[in-house]
């Protein structure tokens, strides 16, 4: 039997400089594409190898992106969120929420779709 799973939630401001191939990550979520039950937020689903985000090292798969250059990502359609990133300019400031899984007791299994990545 698995122990109780808790999450340690932290927020961080990450400043990325757009590279030759862009910011270097994929997202899921939005009001029309809920990735996490009852949450229309925007989550990082992939960090591209050698991309700007990967080289910076702080953004992680499973992170929730709260804002881009100060603009809140709440209640956005998925494509509107994509477009916001694409039009964010050369220097991009991301407010992100990291959700670290803390296991109490025997180690559990995190399934696909869990926002912790």
């Amino acid at each position: 039997m698995n122990g109780r799973v808790d999450y340690l939630v932290t927020e961080e401001e990450i400043n990325l400089t757009r590279g030759p191939s862009g910011l270097g990550f994929n997202i899921v979520g939005g009001t029309d594409q809920q990735y996490v039950s009852n949450d229309s937020g925007i989550y990082v689903s992939r960090i591209k190898e050698n991309g700007a985000a990967a080289l910076d090292g702080r953004l992680q798969e499973g992170d929730k992106i709260l804002s881009v250059n100060g603009q809140d990502l709440k209640n956005l359609l998925h494509q509107d969120a994509v477009d916001l990133f694409r039009n964010a300019g050369y220097a991009v400031s991301l407010r992100v929420q990291h959700r670290l899984q803390v296991q109490n007791g025997p180690i559990g299994h995190r399934g696909e779709g869990d926002p912790s990545g």
């Epitope: 862009g22 994509v82 694409r86």
Partner: nanobody, 127 residues
């Protein structure tokens, strides 16, 4: 881990039709960006078609435009490639590819590096 399984390949005469299917694992299928590629003997892997998470946006190689149609059924975790007016030069192993989510950068559907997961392929032979 996402797993992709293609089916529907076979031998068909020129001018005929085939419908390929690619069944995917994972409860977040509706977020996947999906593509079809093909590889003929002695040639490089070639982009065929791609579709976004909702099915609202599709992309095609010039060589198949007007003959092939990509579609998806998110309820069935499956992406399809309807191939009509087949030509001998369409003979190849056809591969399904997937990535979770949408890139925030400019999207090149024909770049294999855009995809993280690949099926084993299904053989299509047009005589």
């Amino acid at each position: 881990e996402v797993q992709l399984v293609e089916s529907g390949g076979g031998l068909v005469q020129a001018g005929g039709s085939l419908r390929l299917s690619c069944a995917a694992s994972g409860r977040t299928f509706s977020t996947y960006t999906l593509g079809w590629f093909r590889q003929a003997p002695g040639k490089e892997r070639e982009f065929v078609a791609a579709i976004n998470w909702s099915g609202g946006t599709t992309y095609y190689a010039d060589s198949v435009k007007g003959r092939f149609t990509i579609s998806r059924n998110n309820a069935k975790n499956t992406v399809y490639l309807q191939m009509n007016s087949l030509k001998p030069e369409d003979t190849a192993v056809y591969y399904c590819a997937a990535v979770i989510g949408s890139t925030v950068d400019s999207y090149d559907p024909g770049d294999p590096l855009e995809y993280d997961y690949w099926g084993q392929g299904t053989q299509v032979t047009v005589s």
